[in-house]
């Protein structure tokens, strides 16, 4: 029968009596930078080519007994997991093999490096179709290490990484930690977090997505027919660059940002138990396993939209906190969220060519994180229409006045540190819902954009009652691109967006009376694209 | 391109030994094994084996285990089978084909064992 | 006794199509992906035809397919010709070697 893993991640219109999906990857070439490799095992032979790199340091200890099929191991594994004839994701990708691990699964940063290095110069010798390079390892932050995987995805190169294997922040580890690389938790049969003995599977919101690794069968080194189970984000992540080979050999024109999209888009959600994350994780980590589309082609419609979670602030006063999104996407929406609910709102604005969300504490607040609501839009024209703080008792509203633009997001940020505290809610009026409202205090800000096709509507729902949390969400066909609180709510502690639904929170209730002051409203802006629509059926 | 190329004809007498040679070219002989296959004259295919050019590692047949030894010659490319105690039934065709796949195959030595 | 059954032989005429059949057992066919299929002339090396149940080496006909449903592996050739009189052999994995079918003879009328 199939294996756990390779099940998980088939749609079921594939899941035949054994797995066997359209189109292998056989347009892709995947880069292993790992261990040595048993190229010849039956799993994989003629499927990878060992290249001639090899920079590894010494293994550590006097006694080590360099045993070749021990150090061909993890490497050979991932092999089969990416591209392997029966246990593996990718039946048609072929790979190439860099050695940066030596036997005992260590490498260095320099080894590393010069291992992409060699991929951008085979590229440029030879440049061939898609690339994935996988790289299933995870060692301390490192700015250069990000910064040379910044450098190849930027020249198309699709990176694929492994969150780590040390329960903690992945954000902590490179190259993990690098927004270019898509990186890969690990979950389990259960689709719950991966436990490895003390620890277990990275997790935060440097984290895409989880994706199977737990007792995944694998070609093992120990003989040439041989598969064992190994567990780790390094075998998360080798079914990530597998799923990717499939996608980019169905549509080899993908971008990464496209790519990342529709790997999050595609995911299972809502799956995994986030009680297994530290408290302050959960909401920054993304409850989404890795999965094939269910048709190769066909995707282009849909309007693409994920959400990017800046780091965390810190406490001080001014502090700010800024999430971006990738070059080729767009920002449509701005949100903050604050554990204490002590913030100053967010405010879109211009840097370096590009919008991006930026949060502000407040005073005696314990910091926020500003959320980006990331959005992949062809043609897209947007901007930032802000209202300052207004005298009128009515509150702040500003709209899209420009011909043919929509509003896609609503921000408003304030100066006063305790706004809202004894004000009541400000009323949307009812028949305008292409604006923003907000505090008469707080500056509003809309986004505001124009794509072919584009159109926006405003849903929102509205508890009289104080809760903990509201949501909103948007309908099938439709994608959430603005997630907002209606303002005139204190203890809200900010909005983001999950998947195509709209968050709220708001401060524990019992802490809150049940007066109008405890009325909390979640506002979204759901959008679709009507152009990219007519397109995809214009190609099929 | 692709080639395995074998060694030429033996008639051995019944309890000798043959040693076959097979000399890969045209491919990275590491990403691939090389595969042993008899043919008894108006027979079907037995697999008997197979090799790592890699490291030297080997899979043998169970009804053939003790009886054959598969090594390799790094340095020539070359990768060689030796069968021992040979009786009149080892009388075949053997073949050398790439990897486990087999999707390449040396042009066959008839291995002819007289009483 | 050859570990996988095929038919000793079939027969078509030109034109047609034939289907020769290879069980086994899910420990063989059924349980991987790796079923091949070998054209043999009399005096020749086999050829590979079909590898991994249903994929065609480059430079073999498009008139060659490949099949599997649980423990039975097929090969058809659409649109017979005279060259394709030969012996057919299908091969699979087993878990730690390889095992093939005795062979089918064809014949073109």
């Known amino acids: 029968s199939i294996p756990w893993n390779l099940e998980r991640i088939t749609p079921p219109r594939y899941r035949a009596d054994e797995y066997q999906p359209p189109d292998g990857g056989s347009l892709v070439e995947v880069y292993l930078l790992d261990t040595s490799i048993q190229s010849d095992h039956r799993e994989i032979e003629g499927r990878v080519m060992v290249t001639d790199f090899e920079n590894v340091p010494e293994e550590d200890g006097t006694r080590f007994h360099r045993q070749a099929s021990k150090c061909d191991s993890h490497g050979t594994h991932l092999a089969g997991v990416v591209s392997g004839r029966d246990a593996g994701v990718a039946k048609g990708a072929s790979m190439r093999s860099l050695r940066v691990l030596n036997c005992q699964g260590k490498g260095t940063v320099s080894g590393t490096l010069i291992g992409l290095e060699f991929i951008r110069k085979s590229q440029l010798v030879q440049p061939v179709g898609p690339l994935v390079v996988l790289l299933p390892l995870a060692g301390g932050y490192s700015r250069v290490l990000n910064a040379a995987c910044q450098r190849l995805a930027r020249a198309g190169v699709v990176l694929v990484t492994a969150a780590g294997n040390f329960r903690d922040d992945a954000c902590l580890y490179s190259p993990a930690s690098a927004p270019e690389v898509i990186t890969v938790g690990a979950t389990n049969a259960q689709d719950q977090p991966v436990t490895l003995g003390t620890l277990g599977t990275n997790f935060g919101r440097c984290v895409d997505l989880f994706a199977p690794g737990e007792d995944i069968i694998g070609a093992s080194s120990d003989c040439s027919t041989c598969f064992v189970s190994q567990s780790g984000t390094s075998q998360a992540a080798a079914h990530v660059a597998g799923i990717a080979a499939m996608m980019l050999s169905a549509e080899p024109e993908l971008t990464l940002a496209e790519l990342r999209q529709r790997l999050i888009h595609f995911s299972a959600k809502d799956v995994i138990n986030e009680a297994w994350f530290p408290e302050d994780q959960r909401v920054l980590t993304p409850n989404l396993v890795a999965a094939l589309p269910p048709s190769t082609h066909g995707a282009g419609w849909q309007l693409f939209c994920r959400t990017v979670w800046s780091a965390h602030s810190g406490p001080t006063r001014m502090a700010t906190a800024v999430a971006r999104c990738a070059p080729d996407e767009e920002l449509l929406s701005c949100s903050s969220f604050s554990r204490s609910g002590k913030r100053r709102g967010e405010r879109m604005e211009a840097q370096g060519g590009k919008l991006v969300c930026r949060a502000h504490n407040a005073f005696g607040g314990e910091g926020v994180y500003a959320i980006a609501r990331c959005c992949l839009l062809p043609q897209a024209n947007c901007s930032v229409h802000t209202a300052p703080p207004a005298e009128a008792s009515m509150g702040t509203r500003v709209h899209c006045h420009q011909q043919g633009h929509v509003l896609t997001g609503c921000s408003s940020h304030w100066e006063v540190e305790d706004l809202g505290t004894h004000k009541p809610p400000v009323l949307r009026p009812r028949g305008q819902p292409n604006q923003c409202v907000g505090h008469r205090e707080a500056s509003i800000h809309a986004s505001c954009c124009h794509a072919p096709g584009l159109e926006c509507k405003v849903k929102e729902h509205g508890i009289p009652a104080p809760q903990e949390q509201v949501t909103v969400a948007c309908e099938e066909g439709w994608t959430l691109t603005g997630c907002s609180a209606l303002p005139g709510t204190s203890h809200v502690l900010g909005a983001y967006a999950v998947d195509n639904t709209c968050v709220v929170r708001s401060r524990d209730v019992s802490t809150t009376g049940s007066t109008s002051e405890g009325a909390v409203t979640a506002v979204a802006i759901c959008c679709r694209s009507r152009h990219l629509a007519q397109a995809s059926q214009e190609l099929q | 391109q692709v080639q395995l190329v074998q060694s030429g004809a033996e008639v051995k007498k019944s309890g000798a030994s043959v040693k076959v040679s097979c000399k890969a070219s045209g491919y990275t002989l590491t990403s691939y094994g090389i595969s042993w296959v008899r043919q008894a004259p108006g027979q079907g295919l037995e697999w008997m084996g197979w090799?790592?050019?890699?490291?030297?590692?080997?899979n043998y047949a169970q009804k053939v285990q003790g009886r054959v030894t598969m090594t390799t010659d790094t340095s020539t490319s070359t990768v060689y089978m030796e069968v021992r105690s040979l009786r009149s039934d080892d009388t075949a065709v053997y073949y050398c084909?790439?990897?486990?796949?087999?999707?390449?195959w040396g042009q066959g030595t008839t291995v002819t064992v007289s009483s | 006794q050859s570990a996988l059954t095929q038919p000793a032989s079939v027969s078509g005429s030109p034109g047609q199509s034939i289907t020769i059949s290879c069980t086994g057992t899910?420990?063989?066919?059924?349980?991987?992906?790796?079923v091949s299929w070998y054209q043999q002339h009399p005096g020749k090396p086999p050829k590979l035809m079909i590898y991994e149940v249903s994929n065609r080496p480059s430079g073999v006909s498009n008139r060659f397919s490949g099949s599997k449903s649980a423990n039975t592996a097929s090969l058809t050739i659409s649109g017979l010709q005279a060259d394709d009189e030969a012996d057919y052999f299908c091969s699979s994995y087993t878990s730690t070697s390889m095992v093939f079918g005795g062979g089918t003879k064809l014949t073109v009328l």
């Open positions: 090799i790592s050019v890699y490291n030297g590692n080997t």
């Open positions: 899910s420990s063989d066919v059924g349980g991987y992906n790796s």
């Open positions: 084909a790439r990897g486990y796949g087999m999707d390449v």
